[in-house]
C-alpha cells in the first residue's frame, strides 16, 4: 500500500468562452481508495478555490460554469490525490479560456453544383458559424476546413477555407456522388467535430478542370 501516484491535468475545453471543463488522469491509486480535488487561483490572486462542479464533466473532471469563468485571466490549477498513505499533486496547469475553445460544428451546410454558361462548372459550398459563437464582438476569428470525397473513396480531399463561409471547388469527378463536411476552429483553439455529411450528385456532363 502506497501513496497515490502523480495525477495530470491533460485537457481543458470550452464550447464558447463562457464555461469550460478540465479533465485529469489519475496516477496509480497505491492500492487504496483515493480522493481527488482540484484547486485553482487566478493570475494575480493568492486566494485558492476548490473546483465548483465535479459532476457535469464526468469522472475526473472539473466544470467551471458561467459565474466561475473569466476571459483574459489565467487560471492556475492543480489536482491533489489523497489516500490513507499520503498525497501527491499534479504539476500546475496554466489555463486561459480564450485559448481552449472547441466550438460546435458549423451549421446549415449547403452544397450546390453551379454550371455558368461562360465559365467552368464548380461545386459551391456554403455554411454558417455555430450558434454559440459570437463573432460580432471580434473576440473570435473562426477558421474553416472542408473535406469531401466520392462516396466509395477511402481518401478525403481537404481544403482550407480561411475565415470565409463559402467555397468553390472546381476539380471533381463527373457522375460521382460526393460527401461534403465542414469544421471550424478559433485562431487559437481546437477544431470542432466535422459537421454531418451533405451528399451531392455531380452531373455526368460536369467538365473536369485541368
Amino acid at each position: 500500500q502506497l501513496p497515490p501516484g502523480k495525477p495530470e491535468i491533460f485537457k481543458c475545453r470550452s464550447p464558447n468562452k463562457e464555461t469550460f471543463t478540465c479533465w485529469w488522469r489519475p496516477g496509480t491509486d497505491g492500492g487504496l481508495p483515493t480522493n481527488y480535488s482540484l484547486t485553482y487561483h487566478r493570475e494575480g490572486e493568492t486566494l485558492m478555490h476548490e473546483c465548483p462542479d465535479y459532476i457535469t464533466g464526468g469522472p475526473n473532471s472539473c466544470h467551471f460554469g458561467k459565474q466561475y469563468t473569466s476571459m483574459w485571466r489565467t487560471y492556475i490549477m492543480m489536482v491533489n490525490a489523497t489516500n490513507q498513505m499520503g498525497s501527491s499533486f499534479s504539476d500546475e496547469l496554466y489555463v486561459d479560456v480564450t485559448y481552449i475553445v472547441q466550438p460546435d460544428p458549423p451549421l446549415e451546410l449547403a452544397v450546390e453544383v453551379k454550371q455558368p454558361e461562360d465559365r467552368k462548372p464548380y461545386l459551391w459550398i456554403k455554411w454558417s458559424p455555430p450558434t454559440l459563437i459570437d463573432l460580432k464582438t471580434g473576440w473570435f476569428t473562426l477558421l474553416y476546413e472542408i473535406r469531401l470525397k466520392p462516396e466509395k473513396a477511402a481518401e478525403w480531399e481537404i481544403h482550407f477555407a480561411g475565415q470565409q463561409t463559402e467555397f468553390k471547388i472546381l476539380s471533381l469527378h463527373p457522375g460521382q456522388k460526393y460527401l461534403v463536411q465542414v469544421r471550424c476552429k478559433p485562431d487559437h483553439g481546437y477544431w470542432s467535430a466535422w459537421s454531418p455529411a451533405t451528399f451531392i450528385q455531380i452531373p455526368s456532363d460536369f467538365t473536369m478542370n485541368d
Epitope: 485537457k11 481543458c12 504539476d91 496554466y94 489555463v95 480564450t98 481546437y190 477544431w191
Partner: antibody, heavy 120, light 107 residues
Framework: EVQLVQSGAEVKKPGSSVKVSCKAS????????MHWVRQAPGQGLEWIGE????????NYNQKFKDRATLTVDKSTSTAYMELSSLRSEDTAVYYC?????????????WGQGTLVTVSS | DIQMTQSPSSVSASVGDRVTITCKAS??????VAWYQQKPGKAPKLLIY???NRYTGVPSRFSGSGSGTDFTLTISSLQPEDFATYYC?????????FGGGTKVEIK
Amino acid sequence: EVQLVQSGAEVKKPGSSVKVSCKASGYTFTTYWMHWVRQAPGQGLEWIGEIDPSDSYSNYNQKFKDRATLTVDKSTSTAYMELSSLRSEDTAVYYCARNGGLGPAWFSYWGQGTLVTVSS
Amino acid sequence: DIQMTQSPSSVSASVGDRVTITCKASQYVGTAVAWYQQKPGKAPKLLIYSASNRYTGVPSRFSGSGSGTDFTLTISSLQPEDFATYYCQQYSSYPWTFGGGTKVEIK
C-alpha cells in the same frame, strides 16, 4: 519530470536540409503547443514557428514560412523541425520550447538546444 | 513585426544591487510580455509571464511591471546566480519576437 531532449549537433552544406528532433516526456504530448526558437552565435532569440501536437496545426514566422516545416509524431511524443535551403546565416542553436500552459505563447520548458552549423 | 528594444544592452552590478532592465515594444502589446534568463551554453529559463506574474519557483526578487509598450524587469537584490543575459518577449501578435538581450555582468 517534464523533459525535452533534442537530437545532436549537425554540420550541413549550404543548400541542404536539416531535421532536428525534440522528444518530450513527463507530460501528455498533445496537451501543449510546441515552439521552435533559434539563436545565432552571440545573438538573440528568434521564433521560427509553433505546432499543436493534437492536430498538427501550425503557425510560422513569415521569414521561415517557405523553408521551415514543423511536424510531430504522436506515437513517440516527438516534434520535428526541418529547415531547407540552408545558408551560412542559418548557423545557430535551435531550441524546441513547450508552451507554458493552455494559453498564450510563453515558454516554460526548453530543450537543451541543437547546434546546426552550415559550412561549405 | 513588433520590435522589442531592450536597454541597456549590458549592465555591470554587484551582489546586493538593484538592477532594472527595460523593454520597449514598437506597438501596443497589452501585458503580453514574458521575461527569460539565459546563462552561457544553456537554454533560456522563464521568469515572468503576462508582464508581471512570476512563474512557479522563480524567486521573489524578480519582478515585472508595465503594460502597453513599456515594460520593466527588476531584480531587487542581485545574487551571484543572477549574472546572466535577460530577454523580453512579446506574444501579442505574430510573429512572437524577443528583445536583443541585456547582459548582467559582475562589476
